[in-house]
């Protein structure tokens, strides 16, 4: 995603939202768009949600992906309906390719 | 077909060790963590171990941390869980399971029964 | 910990009853909830996850609806073959199964 700085009146994008943090609502509008995977004690938790504000995603969106952990983000309304999140593959930090396979 | 199937289980003194082992097919086995639950006779399930596909990452509760260690082999498409200190509320069926990323423990063993008694 | 209860512990029911089950969680879980079913002697078996998602070769009459603290396993009309025991799980944070509930011939 590219650094670029927040805009006075920041555009506001409706994002998906799927997770702890949104209650009874299945979208919620923010600066960024996000989807996230975690382990949680070996398990796959799948969240997606927004930034309300620019700063806020800023850092967690350049943090690379761990074993434990990947954030995608972007900027867009509904952007990240068909993002899922992905853990690295042995040996790389970044995402784009899968640990897993569906089969 | 996805097959899990357990062994190692037996009958063992309370403070003994035992080595239950999974073995994995139809599936890539190496894709997929994989995951240790058990249920004690007549009781419910309680999950107590995980690990992811390399092996590098564990996962316990804290009833069995420091006294199970999960394990894999992907070169055998094989899990292991090595009990030590075996108590006798340790007793249950062990089932092995795996998940696949969005659908958790979509597939179990049949189980193998560990019994702790003196 | 996330503590897990179900309700009822047991039930009777008749064949082509709907019968629905209760699962609650002490803390919001989103919809990080399977429904599992197990027959005397065998392994469980996953009917529901995500909540809601029925499992692929599960029949139809099997539901699971909820969301946050609060979730649901209905069965619309129960056949012979349902007689079990049916096991809540949460895989939000420290996973945990509820206790079960048996359902019987009536």
């Known amino acids: 995603m590219e650094d670029e700085k927040p805009k006075v009146n920041p555009k506001l994008y409706m994002c998906v939202c799927e997770g702890l943090s949104c209650g009874n609502e299945d979208h919620c509008e923010g600066q960024q768009c996000f989807s996230s995977l975690s382990i949680n004690d070996g398990f796959h938790v799948y969240q997606k949600g927004c930034f309300q504000v620019y700063e806020q995603g800023k850092m967690t969106c350049k943090t690379p992906p761990s074993p434990g952990q990947a954030v995608e983000c972007c900027q867009g309304d509904w952007c990240n309906r068909n993002i899922t999140a992905q853990l690295p593959t042995k040996g790389k930090s970044f995402p784009g390719t899968q640990n897993f396979h569906l089969e | 077909e996805v097959q899990l199937v357990e062994s190692g289980g037996g009958l063992v003194q309370p403070g003994g060790s035992l080595r239950l082992s999974c073995a994995a097919s139809g599936f890539t086995f190496s894709n997929y963590y994989m995951y240790w639950i058990r249920q004690a006779p007549g009781k419910g399930l309680e999950w107590i171990s995980s690990i992811n596909t390399d092996g590098g990452s564990t996962y316990y509760p804290d009833s069995v941390k420091g006294r199970f260690t999960i394990s894999r082999d992907n070169s055998k498409n094989t899990v292991y869980l090595q009990m030590n200190s075996l108590r006798a509320e340790d007793t249950a069926v062990y089932y092995c399971?795996?998940?696949?990323?969005?659908?958790?423990?979509?597939?179990w063993g049949q189980g193998t029964l560990v019994t702790v008694s003196s | 910990d996330i503590q897990m209860t179900q309700s009822p512990s047991s039930l009777s029911a008749s064949v082509g009853d709907r019968v629905t089950i209760s699962c609650k969680a002490s803390?919001?879980?989103?919809?990080?909830l399977n429904w599992f079913q197990q027959k005397p002697g065998e392994a469980p078996k996953l009917l529901i996850y995500?909540?809601?998602s029925l499992q692929t070769g599960i029949p139809s009459r099997f539901s699971g609806s909820g969301s946050g603290t609060d979730f649901t396993l209905t069965i619309s009309s129960l056949q012979p073959e349902d007689f079990a025991i049916y096991f809540c799980?949460?895989?939000?944070?420290?996973?945990?199964f509820g206790p079960g509930t048996k359902v019987e011939i009536k």
């Open positions: 399971a795996k998940s696949t990323p969005n659908i958790p423990l979509a597939y």
């Open positions: 799980f949460q895989y939000s944070s420290g996973p945990t």
């Open positions: 803390q919001n879980i989103y919809k990080y």
């Open positions: 995500y909540s809601n």
